[in-house]
């Protein structure tokens, strides 16, 4: 299996009840506006074939896509949560900037690409869905990167 390096987040990043709650509240607000409940972005298919030692790297890719292609373009929506959560997630992304995989990561890129394609295919409703799953993104980062 490919070796991942620097793919760690300090536990303290997830020991801030206020921002954790705000992340969940942002996800909830967006989830209420999401009518497509059959599609799950951060679910079984995303993790398929990716071992736990590679999982943090996988979630880093999802985090970066979510920030750049979803949260930044939608930054005027779902206030006041968005203005607090986005900088927090951006800091996590920055702390994972040195997280790389030595070796073949094609299987990971394939899974991430499917998520990206789904979001793009759904258009704005795909972006809303991605925001509605920020609680899942947050928890997946916590599970994989600590």
């Amino acid at each position: 299996a490919p070796i991942s390096s620097h793919c760690r987040l300090d536990k303290s990043n997830f020991q801030q009840p206020y921002i954790t709650n705000r992340t969940f509240m942002l996800a909830k607000e967006a989830s209420l506006a999401d009518n497509n409940t059959d599609v799950r972005l951060i679910g079984e298919k995303l993790f398929h074939g990716v071992s736990m030692s590679e999982r943090c790297y996988l979630m880093k890719q999802v985090l970066n896509f979510t920030l750049e292609e979803v949260l930044f373009p939608q930054s005027d929506r779902f206030q006041p949560y968005m203005q607090e959560v986005v900088p927090f997630l951006a800091r996590l992304s920055n702390r994972l900037s040195t997280c790389h995989i030595e070796g073949d990561d094609l299987h990971i890129q394939r899974n991430v690409q499917k998520l990206k394609d789904t979001v793009k295919k759904l258009g704005e409703s795909g972006e809303i869905k991605a925001i509605g799953e920020l609680d899942l993104l947050f928890m997946s980062l916590r599970n994989a990167c600590i």
């Epitope: 954790t20 079984e44 899942l136």
Partner: antibody, heavy 121, light 110 residues
Framework: EVQLVESGGGVVRPGGSLRLSCAAS????????MNWVRQAPGKGLEWVSG????????DYAASVKGRFTISRDNAKNSLYLQMNSLRAEDTALYYC??????????????WGRGTLVTVSS | QAVLTQPSSVSGSPGQSVTISCTGA?????????VSWYQQHPGKTPKLIIY???KRPSGVSNRFSGSKSGNTASLTISRLQAEDESDYYC??????????FGGGTKVTVL
């Protein structure tokens, strides 16, 4: 086939200690978060504690925090629950449970048969 | 006291549909992305029947379906059968990193 087998239950006096074990087989143990869930006689399910794949995060229900400690040994495919300062209300059947898929430790898709803990004077 | 509120019992005749609700405070349950449902027959181990709000594990009958709306998640059992008589529990992960269970609902097939 996924198998989870709990052991270590028994009768203990209030204030006493017990260590529960869960032996896992049939899957790659260190790809999954693991949980302990309990059920008092005739009552509903109560989540007790959970640990992520590498032991980096350990979470507890408010009712056991500070008294119980969850741990895992991935080399031995084993999950543990150290229970100290036991109270009568800790009397229950204790289940070891695994997530349905490795990205979802909160969806408990595989359960052991449980080990009974009785706290009584 | 369970954080998630379920009706203590529901009943229906064979062939009918029954729905069990699971309601929680918004701060506790977030967006309900983490909702699961379990079936437990007397003296048996709990069985996962719905995960990720509305997904069914392999081997679970398609008569079981899950949904969410606002602060309420629901489990619907359609075309009720005698073997569906059981206790049902909802659960959800929370922003405090704990998993909460509902108090359970006894389904009776009349």
């Amino acid at each position: 086939e996924v198998q989870l087998v709990e052991s270590g239950g028994g009768v203990v006096r209030p204030g006493g200690s017990l260590r529960l074990s869960c032996a896992a087989s049939g899957f790659t143990f260190d790809d999954y978060g693991m949980n302990w869930v309990r059920q008092a006689p005739g009552k509903g399910l109560e989540w007790v504690s959970g640990v992520n794949w590498n032991g980096g995060t350990r979470d507890y229900a408010a009712s056991v925090k500070g008294r119980f400690t969850i741990s895992r040994d991935n080399a031995k495919n084993s999950l543990y629950l150290q229970m100290n300062s036991l109270r009568a209300e800790d009397t229950a059947l204790y289940y070891c449970a695994r997530g349905w898929y490795s990205g979802s430790p909160w969806s408990l898709g595989h359960w052991g048969r449980g080990t009974l803990v009785t706290v009584s004077s | 006291q369970a954080v998630l509120t379920q009706p203590s019992s529901v009943s229906g005749s064979p062939g009918q549909s029954v729905t069990i609700s699971c309601t929680g405070a918004s701060g506790d349950v977030g967006a309900y992305n983490f909702v699961s449902w379990y079936q437990q027959h007397p003296g048996k181990t709990p069985k996962l029947i719905i995960y990720d709000v509305n997904k069914r594990p392999s081997g679970v009958s398609n008569r079981f379906s899950g949904s969410k709306s606002g602060n309420t998640a629901s489990l619907t059992i359609s075309r009720l059968q005698a073997e569906d008589e059981s206790d049902y529990y909802c659960s959800s992960y929370t922003s405090r990193y704990t998993t909460e269970f509902g108090g359970g609902t006894k389904v009776t097939v009349l």
